[in-house]
């Protein structure tokens, strides 16, 4: 009789996670009598996967009925494959004995598991930043195999190039993770913008996974402030408005001060949205000119999204003589735009004189 050979025809087998893997093995002879065992790995630390003679292996079934007469097919099927099952499997023939004696091993079959990456999760900065600043977005996806993967970043459909990507671990592993950080320069128009992280992998059949983040979570657009004054009314009252324009997010508190004293505080709420996602708000103050001897310094103080307050001041001129019908008063915008930060300019620093 010919000498026994143990044949594992496939050097490698690739299976999608959740499917079954068939590992083929045949012997060339019935002699000697003895069981087949399947192991993952080699040496003293090898893991027993299936023993024809004894043990309980719920995920493993022999492809061929082991009781079949003259059976020389020792292929097995492993169900519900996970990335943890990856490795090289050896079909090993034993000679019957007490104990059984290892006789000959097949060449081994490497099982690789194709596992889909998890849905990419995109996270933005912890604190908001303003236009012209650069913020970082991070994209993470886990549990994929094989290691080869492609990740792209987009902002409003346009591919980004300023990003850094790492796939871990660097060496062999049952599954891998990817982490990428993209740097995005903000503009005032980015309230409605979106960044997309796109992951392509062999398991996705050309249909990449996407994770998104809205720049609205990352951006702060500070307001412009502008004063306007209507003509003095017959009852010696002047209506002054403070226009707070093009800000985001909506969280805003406005305080009116008359000669440095708080007159009224308001909170913005339920404002209509501009096309670009920003908000406008107009607050007015009725100044009773006849109640003042001297000019009234009005200050519109805006605290936006927890940032240092922005002040805009405006003087309402009161004439030196007692008021009569037809006498004129003037209100003057002094043009001061006081703010803790110098990030913003007030382009309205002209003087306005209004006559009744």
């Amino acid at each position: 009789e010919e000498e026994l050979q143990v044949i594992q025809p496939e050097k490698s087998v690739s299976v999608a996670a959740g499917e079954s893997a068939t590992l083929n093995c045949t012997a060339t002879s019935l002699i000697p009598v003895g069981p087949i065992q399947w192991f993952r790995g080699v040496g003293p630390g090898r893991e027993l996967i299936y023993h024809q003679k004894e043990g309980h292996f719920p995920r493993v079934t022999p492809v061929s009925d082991p009781t079949k007469r003259n059976n020389m097919d020792f292929s097995i099927r492993i169900s519900n494959i996970t990335p943890a099952d990856a490795g090289t499997y050896y079909c090993v023939k034993f000679r019957k004995g007490s104990p059984d004696v290892e006789l000959k091993s097949g060449a081994g079959t490497e099982l690789s598991v194709r596992a889909k990456p998890s849905a990419p999760v995109v996270s933005g900065p912890a604190v908001r930043a303003t236009a012209e600043h650069t913020v970082s977005f991070t994209c993470e996806s886990h549990g994929f195999s094989p290691r080869d993967i492609t990740l792209k970043w987009f902002k409003n459909g346009n591919e980004l190039s300023d990003f850094q990507t790492n796939v871990d671990p660097a060496g062999k592993s049952v599954s891998y993770s990817i982490r990428s950080t993209a740097r995005v320069v903000l503009t005032r128009r980015d309230v409605h913008s979106q960044v997309i992280c796109e992951v392509a992998h062999v398991t996705l059949q050309g249909d990449p996974l996407r994770g998104t983040a809205n720049l609205s979570e990352a951006i702060r657009v500070p307001p412009f402030l502008e004063f306007t004054q209507q003509s003095m009314r017959a009852d010696n009252q002047v209506n002054v408005t403070c226009q707070v324009m093009k800000f985001y997010p909506q969280r805003l508190q406005l305080t009116w001060l008359e000669n440095g004293n708080v007159s009224r505080t308001e909170m913005a709420s339920a404002l209509p949205e501009n096309k670009d996602g920003t908000y406008n708000w107009t607050s007015w103050l009725l100044v009773n000119v006849s109640a003042h001897r001297d000019d009234v310094k009005l200050t519109c103080q805006v605290e936006h999204d927890g940032q240092p307050a922005v002040n805009k001041s405006f003087s309402v001129k009161v004439s030196a003589h007692p008021k009569e019908q037809g006498s004129n008063t003037a209100a003057e915008n002094t043009g001061t735009n006081e703010r803790g930060s110098s990030d913003y300019k007030d382009d309205d620093d002209k003087h306005h004189h209004h006559h009744h």
């Epitope: 019935l30 002699i31 023993h51």
Partner: antibody
Framework: QVQLVQSGAEVKKPGASVKVSCKAS????????INWVRQAPGQGLEWIAM????????HYNQIFKDRATLTTDTSTSTAYMELRSLRSDDTAVYYC????????????WGRGTLVTVSS | DIVLTQSPDSLAVSLGERATINCRAS??????????IFWYQQKPGQPPKLLIY???NLDSGVPDRFSGSGSGTDFTLTISSLQAEDVAVYYC????????FGQGTKLEIK
């Protein structure tokens, strides 16, 4: 190691039935055939039948086809051989044996159960 | 059915001498290159023990003074140097189809 432990001796009257058990251990019961062989006093070996515990497939010696029934209980790894309509010439030691190589051979044997048929 | 006939029915051999037992099948027991003949040893009060499988292969733990040979219909069990513990009845069995045994050969010491 492989062990086949058989039930104790039986004394039966002619016409009665006997059911001999064989409890297997030390291997996966469903992966190997169980054979039943008998030996009358001072006589040779006579093959009765075999059963595959995984699916209860059986093969019988024509001589015993109508009187013998093989069964298994995989939950207890036990094989059974029932012989009906006993006659005095059924007096014998009944052996169970495991076929390790699926060659229809008998690699491991139980110690035997003596069945005596006497009126 | 294939009938196996063993010869002789009994045999007496001196210790240390060669013992030869024959088994003839009524038709060939060969299939796919294998000879489906098995040899068993049975000592008094014990179950049989497998010695040789597929005509010529020694089972695990069997002393190498035992050997098997033959093909087709004629087979031989040989004990090259008889030991006292070899006194037993020897049976051949085929499994070309459903198993049958030879009638047995009683081996004694001369």
């Amino acid at each position: 190691q492989v062990q086949l432990v058989q039930s104790g001796a039986e004394v039966k009257k002619p016409g009665a039935s006997v059911k001999v058990s064989c409890k297997a251990s030390g291997y996966t019961f469903t992966n190997y055939w169980i054979n039943w062989v008998r030996q009358a006093p001072g006589q040779g070996l006579e093959w009765i039948a075999m059963i595959d515990p995984s699916d209860s497939e059986t093969h019988y010696n024509q001589i015993f086809k109508d009187r013998a029934t093989l069964t298994t209980d995989t939950s207890t790894s036990t094989a059974y051989m029932e012989l009906r309509s006993l006659r005095s010439d059924d007096t014998a030691v009944y052996y169970c044996a495991m076929d390790y190589g699926s060659l229809y051979a008998m690699d491991y044997w139980g110690r035997g159960t003596l069945v005596t048929v006497s009126s | 059915d294939i009938v196996l006939t063993q010869s002789p029915d009994s045999l007496a051999v001196s210790l240390g001498e060669r013992a030869t037992i024959n088994c003839r099948a009524s038709k060939s027991v060969s299939s796919s290159g294998y000879n489906y003949i098995f040899w068993y040893q049975q000592k008094p009060g014990q179950p049989p023990k497998l010695l040789i499988y597929l005509a010529s292969n020694l089972d695990s733990g069997v002393p190498d003074r035992f050997s098997g040979s033959g093909s087709g219909t004629d087979f031989t069990l040989t004990i090259s140097s008889l030991q006292a513990e070899d006194v037993a009845v020897y049976y051949c069995q085929h499994s070309r189809d459903l198993p049958t045994f030879g009638q047995g050969t009683k081996l004694e010491i001369k």
